[in-house]
Interface confidence: low
C-alpha cells in the first residue's frame, strides 16, 4: 500500500557559480499517472514533463520519466537566484522547492595608497577593493610569507542590490627589511574554490647607509699589492666614499673611491682606516686595522666596524 | 520566521573552556549567515564571530581570535561557539544571530533575528 507521502515530490537546495550550470533534480515514488513540472521563481513553468515551456535556450531537459524531472540551467545568472518549485499534478497538487543560491564571483582585487619614497620607521597605509562578491567575500593582507592584521573588512552593497564591495586597509611602520617586499592583498570566496585571487604592490623603502671594509687578499702580507673595498648598501646606494687614515691630525685624507688601492704593501702601511659611505639618506663609517707583517704565511690583521 | 534557542552558558575558571549552542528552526537555515554577539554587563553589544552559509568563511573580533571557534553543522541546523582560555573579561551575555537574508554581515545592524542570550561567567 502507498502511503500519501510517496505521491510528494522531493528535491534539494542548490548553489551553484554565476556563470555556471546548475542541475535541478526533482522525484517522486508515486507519480499517480501525473507529469512532474518545473517552475521559476517567477513562477513561469519551465518544462512540464518532457515539454519545454519557456523559451530560454539556457534551460535544458536533462531527465524526464515517472518519477523523476531533472532539467539544468546553464549560464546562470545572480537575477536567477530563487525558490524553483516541482509541482506534481495530482488531487490535491504537491510541490516541492528548491532554492537556488547564486554566488558571486569577487573581480581581482585593486590595491591603492602607495605613496613613494617611504623612509625607514615611516607608517604605510595601503587600501584593498574587490567587487562583484555574493556573499561579501574577505579580504587578507601578507607581507612575502608574513600574514599582515589588516582593519576588518567593510562590506558595501553594490549597485545592482546583489553583489558587494569590499574594502580594507592595512597600516605598517617599514624597515630596510622592507625595500623590495611585496604586500599582497588576497580576495577569499567560496566560489573560487581555493583559487587564489590577489594583486601585490612591490613596496621602495629608503635608508641610511651601511657599509663593511672587505680587504683584498683577505690576509696581506708585505709586498703584496692590496685593495680595500668599502662595500656600501642602503637605499639609494652610496654613491660618495671618502677614505682616511687615522692618527693623523686631522685624519689624511686618501681618495673618494669606493676602493682603496695599496699597488706594494708597506710596513708603514700599518694603521686604522676608516671608510665614510654617503647617500642622500645620511652617512656611516667603518673601520679596518690594517697590520701589515713580514711576507711570511703567517696572516695578521683584523677588522672593526661601527 | 526563524527561531534561535540557546544553550550552553554556565560558570566557569579562568583559563577553563565552554560551548555554545544555538539551535535554529526554519528551513532555509543553511542559506544564511550566522554570528555570535555578546553583552557584558553596562557596556554594548559587541560583535564576536561570524560564518558564511557555506561555514567556509568565518570572521572574528580581536579579542575572539586564537581562543574562539565558531562552526555550524547545517544537517542539525546548530551553531556553536567553542571557547577555550577564557578570560574574567568575556564575562558576558552571549547572543547568536541570523540576517534575513544571505548578507553576511560583521555588525549586529546586519542581523534581523537574535537568541534568547545565555550568560557566561568566568570566575575563580
Known amino acids: 500500500n502507498l502511503s500519501q507521502d510517496d505521491s510528494q515530490p522531493w528535491t534539494s537546495d542548490e548553489t551553484v557559480v554565476a556563470g555556471g550550470t546548475v542541475v535541478l533534480k526533482c522525484q517522486v515514488k508515486d507519480h499517480e499517472d501525473s507529469s512532474l513540472q518545473w517552475s521559476n521563481p517567477a513562477q513561469q513553468t519551465l518544462y512540464f514533463g518532457e515539454k519545454r515551456a519557456l523559451r530560454d535556450n539556457r534551460i535544458q531537459l536533462v531527465t524526464s520519466t515517472p518519477h523523476e524531472l531533472s532539467i539544468s540551467i546553464s549560464n546562470v545568472a545572480l537575477a536567477d537566484e530563487g525558490e524553483y518549485t516541482c509541482s506534481i499534478f495530482t488531487m490535491p497538487v504537491r510541490t516541492a522547492k528548491s532554492l537556488v543560491t547564486v554566488l558571486g564571483i569577487p573581480q581581482k582585487p585593486i590595491i591603492t595608497g602607495y605613496k613613494s619614497s617611504l623612509r625607514e620607521k615611516d607608517t604605510a597605509t595601503l587600501n584593498c577593493q574587490s567587487s562583484g562578491s555574493k556573499p561579501a567575500a574577505r579580504l587578507t593582507w601578507r607581507k612575502g610569507d608574513q600574514e599582515l592584521h589588516g582593519e576588518p573588512t567593510r562590506i558595501q552593497e553594490d549597485p545592482n542590490g546583489k553583489t558587494f564591495t569590499v574594502s580594507s586597509s592595512v597600516t605598517f611602520q617599514v624597515t630596510r627589511e622592507d625595500d623590495g617586499a611585496s604586500i599582497v592583498c588576497s580576495v577569499n570566496h567560496e566560489s573560487l574554490k581555493g583559487a587564489d585571487r590577489s594583486t601585490s604592490q612591490r613596496i621602495e623603502v629608503l635608508y641610511t647607509p651601511t657599509a663593511m671594509i672587505r680587504p683584498d687578499p683577505p690576509h696581506p702580507r708585505e709586498g703584496q699589492k692590496l685593495l680595500l673595498h668599502c662595500e656600501g648598501r642602503g637605499n639609494p646606494v652610496p654613491q660618495q666614499y671618502l677614505w682616511e687614515k687615522e692618527g693623523s691630525v686631522p685624519p689624511l685624507k686618501m681618495t673618494q673611491e669606493s676602493a682603496l688601492i695599496f699597488p706594494f704593501l708597506n710596513k708603514s702601511d700599518s694603521g686604522t682606516y676608516g671608510c665614510t659611505a654617503t647617500s642622500n639618506m645620511g652617512s656611516y663609517k667603518a673601520y679596518y686595522t690594517l697590520n701589515v707583517n713580514d711576507p711570511s704565511p703567517v696572516p695578521s690583521s683584523s677588522s672593526t666596524y661601527h | 520566521q526563524v527561531q534561535l534557542v540557546q544553550s550552553g552558558g554556565g560558570l566557569v575558571q579562568p583559563g577553563g573552556s565552554l560551548r555554545l549552542s544555538c539551535a535554529a528552526s526554519g528551513r532555509t537555515f543553511s542559506n544564511y549567515a550566522r554570528g555570535w554577539f555578546r553583552q557584558a554587563p553596562g557596556k554594548g553589544r559587541e560583535f564576536v564571530a561570524a560564518?558564511?552559509?557555506?561555514?567556509?568563511?568565518?570572521n572574528y573580533a580581536d579579542s575572539a581570535k586564537g581562543r574562539f571557534t565558531i562552526s555550524r553543522d547545517n544537517s542539525k541546523n546548530t551553531l556553536y561557539l567553542q571557547m577555550n582560555s577564557l578570560r574574567a573579561e568575556d564575562t558576558a551575555v552571549y547572543y547568536c544571530?541570523?540576517?534575513?537574508?544571505?548578507?553576511?554581515?560583521?555588525?549586529?545592524?546586519?542581523?534581523?533575528?537574535w537568541g534568547q542570550g545565555t550568560l557566561v561567567t568566568v570566575s575563580s
Open positions: 544571530a541570523a540576517p534575513a537574508s544571505r548578507r553576511p554581515s560583521w555588525d549586529a545592524d546586519g542581523y534581523d533575528y
Open positions: 560564518i558564511d552559509y557555506s561555514g567556509g568563511s568565518t
